[in-house]
């Protein structure tokens, strides 16, 4: 697009991941400029003709927006003057993955930065004691993952032990035919021990912990995005 201003301004983006079917954010910041009407933000995607989003003269201009992003994008308009050009993306799709460019023009100059956006599915695992089994077992379930993750079990007492022989993991395709439900059962568990179910793909890593004692069951889950 046409550039005015002789200087280059610093534009910063962060590699991020989007969860299919959820809403995501593509992060981009730039040197602030109090003159809102002089700020132009353009988001582009490699391989796509037209724009992902454009914001100029204090408002959106979606006249050049590509059809695949229709009704799905917004900038944080009240934060543009403080240098936030991040883009909200509704209902993230697998096809949204790729290289995006955040172009900025202000009265101070112009600049741009690329962002690698990964898409997949990731969710928190939940571990429960499976009382239906013939022997005491644990059931780890996570509703939405893509691509297919690896699942591993660990135990605080038996550190370094390989539980693959005493566990069974299955992947069930969800109704939208992309994401999958992960179910892993660990057999022959012992009481007064903490077990961890770890689910990981190239986008995220999730861990569910469960501590089973005579008197109580304690659970904890965490999710970490990789390379973000």
């Amino acid at each position: 697009f046409g550039i005015s201003g002789k200087h280059f301004i610093t534009v910063t983006t962060f590699t991020s991941a989007g969860n299919i079917g959820e809403d995501g954010t593509l992060s981009c910041t730039f040197e602030p400029d109090i003159k809102l009407n002089g700020i132009v933000i353009q988001w582009l995607k490699e391989g796509i003709k037209g724009l992902v989003h454009e914001f100029k003269e204090g408002k959106d201009d979606l006249s050049q927006q590509h059809e695949m992003f229709r009704g799905r994008t917004a900038v944080f308009a009240d934060q543009v003057v403080v240098g936030n050009a991040s883009l909200r993306l509704k209902n993230v799709q697998l096809t949204d993955a790729g290289t995006y460019t955040c172009y900025i023009r202000t009265s101070k100059g112009k600049g741009n930065a690329n962002l690698e956006y990964k898409t997949g599915a990731f969710s928190m695992p939940e571990i429960n004691v499976d009382y239906n089994a013939s022997s005491e077992s644990l059931r780890c379930e996570a509703p939405r993952w893509f691509p297919q993750p690896t699942v591993a079990w660990a135990s605080q007492v038996d550190q370094g032990a390989n539980f693959s022989e005493v566990s069974n993991t299955s992947f069930e395709l969800n109704s939208e035919n992309v994401t999958m439900k992960v179910v892993s059962v660990l057999y022959n568990v012992t009481i007064n021990n903490t077990y961890s179910c770890m689910i990981e793909n190239d986008i995220a890593k999730a861990t569910g912990d469960i501590k089973v004692t005579d008197s109580e069951v304690k659970r904890r889950s965490q999710l970490q995005l990789l390379n973000s």
Partner: antibody
Framework: QLQLQESGPGLVKPSETLSLTCTVS??????????WGWIRQPPGKGLEWIGN???????YYNPSLKSRVTISVDTSKNQFSLKLSSVTAADTAVYYC????????????WGQGTLVTVSS | EIVMTQSPATLSVSPGERATLSCRAS??????LAWYQQKPGQAPRLLIY???TRATGIPARFSGSGSGTEFTLTISSLQSEDFAVYYC?????????FGGGTKVEIK
């Protein structure tokens, strides 16, 4: 304060084309952060989203009506229009126009609606 | 398309009481949900968007909650002007779709 007003014939014959216009006042149809939509409501029933248009002319239609619907815009008159072809009695409804957020895509405000009856 | 289901179809409540309306989506719509109020002979009016954000000028007695597939509109203390039909609408994916509505009537 933004206002929308639907206008057009209240009676259309079966197999003909229903044509309605929505006039926007108190604001510009060229607002960058909004689409302009049509919604209908058969008597005593629920709401059905028909489609929307951006001031530049790009449209999106409900697939269930896509083959029969055309939405157009006239920025010089601050108006947008709906055409629905090959109508039947099932198209009898109150037709509303509304401003639609580009995202979040809420509908606000709405026109007061106009009843279109399809009958010979 | 995403199917929106509202319950109950009719809710009989006395003025001053609390009303709880439910809306369920056939698949996750994240927080991309709006609530509208419609009185007889009038156009719908936006109450809530983003599942929980009140639109401009909407009284604090209206509140929305939920995400994913289960949503609730709560009217904390019903006023006479609140008796109407309420619709939920998802704008998560095209085509945008509405629930069948819940009629809140005087008990």
């Amino acid at each position: 304060q933004l206002q929308l007003q639907e206008s057009g014939p209240g009676l259309v014959k079966p197999s003909e084309t229903l044509s309605l216009t929505c006039t926007v006042s108190g604001g510009s149809i060229k607002s960058g952060s909004h689409y302009w939509g049509w919604i209908r409501q058969p008597p005593g029933k629920g709401l059905e989203w028909i489609g929307n248009i951006y001031y530049s002319g790009s449209t999106y239609y409900n697939p269930s009506l896509k083959s029969r619907v055309t939405i157009s815009v006239d920025t010089s008159k601050n108006q947008f229009s709906l055409k629905l072809s090959s109508v039947t009695a099932a198209d009898t409804a109150v037709y509303y126009c509304a401003r639609e957020g580009s995202y979040p895509n809420w509908l606000d405000p709405w026109g007061q609606g106009t009843l279109v009856t399809v009958s010979s | 398309e995403i199917v929106m289901t509202q319950s109950p179809a009719t809710l009989s409540v006395s003025p001053g009481e609390r009303a709880t309306l439910s809306c369920r989506a056939s698949q996750s719509v994240s927080s991309n949900l709006a609530w509208y109020q419609q009185k007889p002979g009038q156009a719908p009016r936006l109450l809530i968007y983003g599942a929980s954000t009140r639109a401009t000028g909407i009284p604090a007695r209206f509140s929305g909650s939920g995400s994913g597939t289960e949503f609730t509109l709560t009217i904390s203390s019903l006023q006479s002007e609140d008796f109407a039909v309420y619709y939920c609408q998802q704008y998560h994916s095209f085509p945008f779709t509405f629930g069948g509505g819940t009629k809140v009537e005087i008990k």
